[in-house]
Interface confidence: low
């Protein structure tokens, strides 16, 4: 048994006679043999759920759900209740109605076994019938909405008549009807004015019925019509078995370059026309089990359940449904040597589903784990300027497909054939598993005999120690020119183009800093700044070379304070800046300020 509403509303007036009918509450059956039996909670409640008093005024007919006054609510009774309402004016009181045999404690009132009945209190006697407006004669102030469970026996869930009006104004004729399209499952009995369902409802066909209740008032010669919405919501039960959209119960996947823990290898989607169990209960009651089989697979993969509400079209209206994505996820990093093919089965069990049929599906994942071979091109040829400063990035080495790698830890090393010409260093980029080549020793770079540098690049997979090798041939070009005195260590210090381009700084491949002219569009990612190389700095990312020294690219790497209009980078640096941004790495400060309009024209004229 369950209530067709969680709350009812009626008006209460002072001195209404004992025996005045107030309203009906309605229970609907979950099973055909059920017989509703109603009981009232012991207490009346006021503002903020304050328990006011034992309910001595209102009764309920156990079998019909009719609430009525068993004694008149007089002024003194009202004052008695008002005093207990924590000083708030007593405008509304409520009662709890329970459905027997549901043995809910008085303190709790949760639908479906309990409903609240609210009474708006008017500290006056019932108004003269002639003064009541048609709206007041027809409907309560608060518009009702109804909840009906799907697949349950049909039954009466509402009674249109306002009982106090009918009781106290017998000469006013009030008629009701429901405006509804053909074939809808509701009827309003013309004599009793009871609204009932004609047959069991199916939420998967229609979830909401936006009906209209029409009330016609005849008082003497006048006839007036009032219309109000009459919404019915169909409540779901787990009556739909999970299914595979388009019958797809198998997903095939190849694990090759993406071998990192938590990588989603494959996804299978399960559709369930139901929206129960509710989200809080869903993962506990809608279970997925990776079936036992190969213990390697059990340890290597897990299944993640990602449910989502969706809506589907049914009979011209949209109803909610659930899609469950089951993701096969790597439970650990796989070494590049692992090589297996297997079938995994996942049992999905909609444990609340009662049939007919089984609420169980088997998902199949065909997974091939392929080994990864490390390959480097036979030779790399690069050139570097003799003027390049320390930490200048001059190129990249990368094993085949390294950009696609994840979960594969490749380390690069350089072995120099000439000990005195060991100019370059290499660091491994965590982002794309490449090796960034950079100038490590500028002294060696300037030696005349170091015009050609020969290295062996060795890429090693840290987990398996497998290796790949390549020759690296670096040509040193140009001649060294000492830079002007007074130049800062960091290009980022320079605030103007001219001073920027006159100096070099850490990380500069040409021995000169580069000016990046911004777009001048407020706080922008493309702010004006001085950089060792605009290819790499600033790019919103503090790369593995830039982390070696804060002077290389504080625009990307600074953890200190940024003054002026900006958006901070995540987790450091300047994501966007206003005008020109320059930095003082030693002081751990950057400044973003409006462009100086005089620069560079003024500087040119003033020379």
């Amino acid at each position: 048994l369950y209530f067709s509403r969680d709350a009812y509303w009626e008006k209460l007036y002072v001195d209404q006679a004992a025996g005045t009918p107030l309203l009906y509450v309605h229970a609907l059956r979950d099973a055909p043999e059920e017989v509703p039996s109603f009981r009232l909670g012991q207490h009346l409640y006021g503002t903020y759920r304050t328990r006011l008093h034992e309910n001595n005024w209102i009764c309920i007919q156990e079998d019909t759900g009719l609430l009525y006054l068993n004694r008149s609510l007089d002024h003194s009774s009202w004052e008695k209740l008002s005093v207990r309402n924590r000083g708030f004016p007593l405008l509304t009181v409520y009662l709890k109605v329970f459905l027997s045999p549901t043995s809910l404690r008085e303190g709790e009132c949760q639908w479906p076994g309990c409903a609240r009945v609210y009474f708006s209190f008017f500290n006056t006697s019932f108004p003269a019938c002639s003064s009541l407006k048609p709206r007041e004669l027809c409907f309560p102030e608060t518009r009702p909405s109804f909840r009906i469970r799907e697949n349950r026996p049909p039954g009466t869930f509402h009674q249109f008549r306002l009982l106090p009006v009918q009781f106290l104004c017998p000469n006013i004729s009030v008629a009701y009807r429901l405006l509804e399209g053909e074939g809808l499952p509701f009827r309003c009995a013309p004599d009793s004015l009871e609204v009932s369902t004609r047959w069991a409802l199916d939420r998967e066909q229609r979830e909401k019925y936006e009906l209209v209740a029409v009330c016609t008032v005849h008082a003497g010669a006048r006839e007036e019509v009032v219309m109000v919405p009459f919404p019915v919501t169909v409540y779901d039960e787990d009556d739909s078995a999970p299914t595979f959209p388009a019958g797809v119960d198998t997903a095939s996947a190849v694990v090759e370059f993406k071998r990192k823990e938590d990588t989603v290898v494959a996804t299978l989607r399960v559709f369930d026309a139901d929206v129960v169990p509710a989200s809080g209960e869903l993962v506990r009651r809608y279970t997925s089990t990776l079936l036992p089989g190969d213990t390697w697979a059990q340890q290597t993969f897990r299944v993640e359940h990602w449910p989502n509400e969706t809506s589907v079209q049914a009979n011209g209206s949209f109803v909610r449904a659930t899609v469950h994505d089951y993701r096969l996820v790597l439970n650990r990093n796989l070494s590049i040597s692992e090589n297996r093919t297997m079938q995994l089965a996942v049992l999905v069990n909609d444990s609340d589903f009662q049939g007919p049929g089984a609420g169980v599906l088997l998902l199949h994942f065909n997974v091939s784990v392929l080994p990864v071979s490390l390959h480097l091109p036979s030779t790399y040829s690069l050139s570097v300027s003799r003027r390049a400063r320390r930490f200048a990035q001059i190129g990249k080495v990368c094993v085949e497909n390294c950009q696609a790698f994840s979960g594969i830890n490749v380390q690069y090393k350089l072995h120099s054939s000439g000990a005195n010409c060991s100019t370059l260093g290499v660091v491994t980029s965590a982002e794309d598993t490449s090796g960034i080549l950079f100038v490590n020793d500028t002294k060696a770079l300037r030696r005349p005999k170091c015009a050609e540098l020969h290295y062996m690049v060795v890429a090693t997979d840290q987990q398996t120690s497998r290796q790949a090798q390549a020759q690296l041939l670096v040509t040193v070009e140009g001649s060294y020119v000492a830079e002007e005195a007074g130049c800062p260590l960091s290009c980022a210090v320079s605030k103007r183009r001219l001073e920027c381009e006159e100096c070099g700084g850490l990380g500069s491949p040409t021995g000169r800093c580069e000016w990046r002219q911004g777009d001048g569009k407020g706080i922008t990612r493309n702010f004006s700044t001085c950089s060792p190389s605009t290819k790499t700095c600033p790019d919103g990312h503090c790369d593995v070379v830039e982390t070696q020294d804060i002077n290389i690219c504080p625009q990307d790497c600074l953890r200190g304070s940024i003054v002026g209009g900006h958006e901070p980078g995540e987790p450091r640096g300047i994501k966007a800046g206003y005008g020109t941004c320059n930095c003082f790495p030693e002081e751990e400060k950057c400044f973003c300020e409006p462009e100086d309009i005089q620069d560079p024209l003024c500087d040119e004229l003033c020379r």
């Epitope: 190969d294 297997m342 069990n349 169980v360």
Partner: antibody, heavy 125, light 107 residues
Framework: EVNLEESGGGLVQPGGSMKLSCVAS????????MNWVRQSPEKGLEWVAD??????????HYAESVNGRFTISRDDSTSSVYLQMNNLRAEDTGIYYC????????????????WGQGTSVTVSS | DIVMTQSHKFMSTSVGDRVSITCKAS??????VAWYQQKPGQSPKLLIY???TRHTGVPDRFTGVGSGTDYSLTISSVQAEDLALYYC?????????FGGGTKLEIK
């Protein structure tokens, strides 16, 4: 038609060893996981061990009671599965069946779809 | 390990009767239950898996039902050839475990 034929049973003293063989026919042996199951009046049906496929590196599982004493192996070229039993005990007595997991349309269901006729093993002094 | 309990060692029935053999798992096995039939002097034969799916060639008078921990095998109209030992097995988790068996006898 699936056919499984066990051999190698007999009488052995406690602490002794024995090797059971099972030859399969009527299906593609290399595509199927294989099992040994035993039956005794005292313990009823008891799963003993299974062995997976080449693609799963011939992974094996054992019942706790035989782990470390019994070894399951297979030879796909002769469609044979073996059970090497060492350090035998009186409670290992029973009929030993070779069985194959049922392969449905999509997957191996971990149920024993086909069984041999069994070979009797008695461990007694 | 999951323990499978068949509470009836013997069940007596007549040809044409409907009979249900029950099996209880020590934990929720998510319908991963199989049923086997073993006739005297023969090896067991698979009847049902996944609680209710009939194996190839099994007559439709054999029906499996259940969920959670409680499962049963029903023979809707017992035939003389159905006299046998019936075992349940959980295929939820290794080690696979069997019930003690129920012997179906004719009155």
């Amino acid at each position: 038609e699936v056919n499984l034929e066990e051999s190698g049973g007999g009488l052995v003293q406690p602490g002794g060893s024995m090797k059971l063989s099972c030859v399969a026919s009527g299906f593609t042996f290399s595509n199927y996981w294989m099992n040994w199951v035993r039956q005794s009046p005292e313990k009823g049906l008891e799963w003993v061990a299974d062995i997976s496929l080449k693609s799963n590196n011939y992974g094996t599982h054992y019942a706790e009671s035989v782990n470390g004493r019994f070894t399951i192996s297979r030879d796909d070229s002769t469609s044979s599965v073996y059970l090497q039993m060492n350090n035998l005990r009186a409670e290992d007595t029973g009929i030993y069946y070779c069985a194959v997991y049922y392969y449905g349309v999509k997957f191996y269901y971990f149920v024993l779809g086909y069984w041999g006729q069994g070979t009797s093993v008695t461990v007694s002094s | 390990d999951i323990v499978m309990t068949q509470s009836h060692k013997f069940m007596s029935t007549s040809v044409g009767d409907r009979v249900s053999i029950t099996c209880k798992a020590s934990q929720d096995v998510s319908t991963a239950v199989a049923w086997y039939q073993q006739k005297p002097g023969q090896s067991p034969k698979l009847l049902i898996y996944w609680g209710s799916t009939r194996h190839t060639g099994v007559p439709d008078r054999f029906t499996g039902v259940g969920s959670g921990t409680d499962y049963s095998l029903t023979i809707s109209s017992v035939q003389a050839e159905d006299l046998a030992l019936y075992y349940c097995q959980q295929h939820y988790n290794i080690p696979w475990t069997f019930g003690g068996g129920t012997k179906l006898e004719i009155k």
